[in-house]
């Protein structure tokens, strides 16, 4: 058997036989192009693609269209993946889309998605979300039916306020909805009464920004 | 520091009338969208009514509309809830809350009155109507 060169995702690398969590290459669907990203092998089994990681403030996530669309920031630690490419994967296969969150208190809570995907630039990245269940509340955070990307000059939320320059951070934003895992990162002791913190509503509630997130994708069939 | 003391809850019987206020310090009421919400035991908190003073428009939850009436003061900082034709359905912990001003929906400019849209939060007051 001819061992695979290319992957993907991170269920594709880790079915060959690397296990073992890091940074690993990816190919773009249908072409050459290569991107790369954090596998997480541990969690739930493994085989998990991080398209989107907080930790400590270390990047700044007010970024443009472009950026967002790309990719920005480390792989080993904040980063986004880039919407280009996970739209890409995600309208080829069925995804689930597991969300994991910390607060400053060391609670840790989690969202399943067990339907994800992000619909192509021609429609701002529009995300598409079913079937939630998880620790982070009994409601979506991410309003629900999903919403279009907004960024700080593309502005395509269902506000007249300009959502991402108001909260900071590009995010599927409603008007402006229940949650912002690309705002502002506020430390311990400066983090409630935030308006434009990493929130997730039907966790924290309103104005408590998180201390970590993480946001990871998985074939359904894996 | 951004602080909201709500008052003016109580035990009331069905079709009497209640005024509840929210008394703001530490920021101006134009600055700010004020919101009124209640929680019931075992249910999400939801919004009753807000304003907005800077321009003075307001939006009411269908089950409240023609009977709770949201009003400011803004010389002595205070948000009121006049609510008339109460039922017993409108037994619930009534929290004040104050958020960003200027989120109106595209499209309809009604103004935004989500709990998840509003930052700062009062302690609540009991409002609990008997039939």
């Known amino acids: 058997k001819e061992e695979q060169t290319t992957f993907r995702d991170c269920a594709e690398i880790f079915k060959s036989g690397l296990t073992t969590s890091g940074i690993y290459t990816l190919t773009f669907p249908n072409s050459t192009e290569e991107i790369k990203a954090y596998c997480d092998m541990d969690v739930g089994g493994g085989g998990w693609t991080v398209i989107q990681h907080r930790e400590d403030g270390s990047v700044d996530f007010q970024r443009t269209w472009k950026e967002y669309k790309e990719g920005f920031g480390s792989p080993l630690g904040e980063y986004w993946l880039g919407n280009e490419f996970v739209s890409q994967l995600t309208g080829q296969h069925r995804y689930v889309l597991k969300i994991q969150l910390k607060d400053w208190e060391g609670n840790e809570a989690h969202s399943l998605y067990d339907h994800f995907y992000l619909a192509g630039e021609e429609s701002n990245y529009r995300i598409h979300l079913t079937g939630l269940t998880g620790t982070a509340g009994k409601i979506s955070s991410i309003s629900q039916p999903g919403s279009d990307f907004s960024t700080k000059d593309s502005d395509n939320d269902k506000c007249i306020c300009k959502c991402s320059q108001m909260l900071s951070g590009g995010w599927w934003f409603d008007a402006c909805g229940p949650s912002n895992l690309n705002g502002q990162y506020y430390p311990q002791k400066q983090n409630t009464n935030k308006f434009n913190g990493i929130k997730w509503y039907y966790w924290k509630g309103s104005g408590y920004s998180l201390k970590a997130t993480t946001m990871m994708i998985r074939p359904a069939d894996f | 520091e951004v602080q909201l003391v709500e008052s003016g809850g109580g035990l009331v019987q069905a079709g009497g009338s209640l005024r509840l206020s929210c008394a703001a310090s530490?920021?101006?009421?134009?600055?700010?969208?004020i919101g009124w919400f209640r929680q019931a035991p075992g249910k999400e908190r939801e919004g009753v009514s807000c304003i907005s003073s800077s321009d003075g428009s307001t939006t009411y939850a269908d089950s409240v509309k023609g009977r709770f009436t949201v009003s400011s003061d803004n010389a002595k900082n205070t948000v009121y809830l006049q609510m008339n034709s109460l039922k017993p359905e409108d037994t619930a912990v009534y929290y004040c809350a104050a958020g960003l001003r200027g989120r109106y929906y595209r499209g309809t400019y009604s103004l935004v009155c989500a709990p998840y849209e509003y930052d700062f939060w009062g302690q609540g007051t009991q409002v609990t109507v008997s039939s």
């Open positions: 530490g920021f101006t009421l134009d600055d700010y969208a």
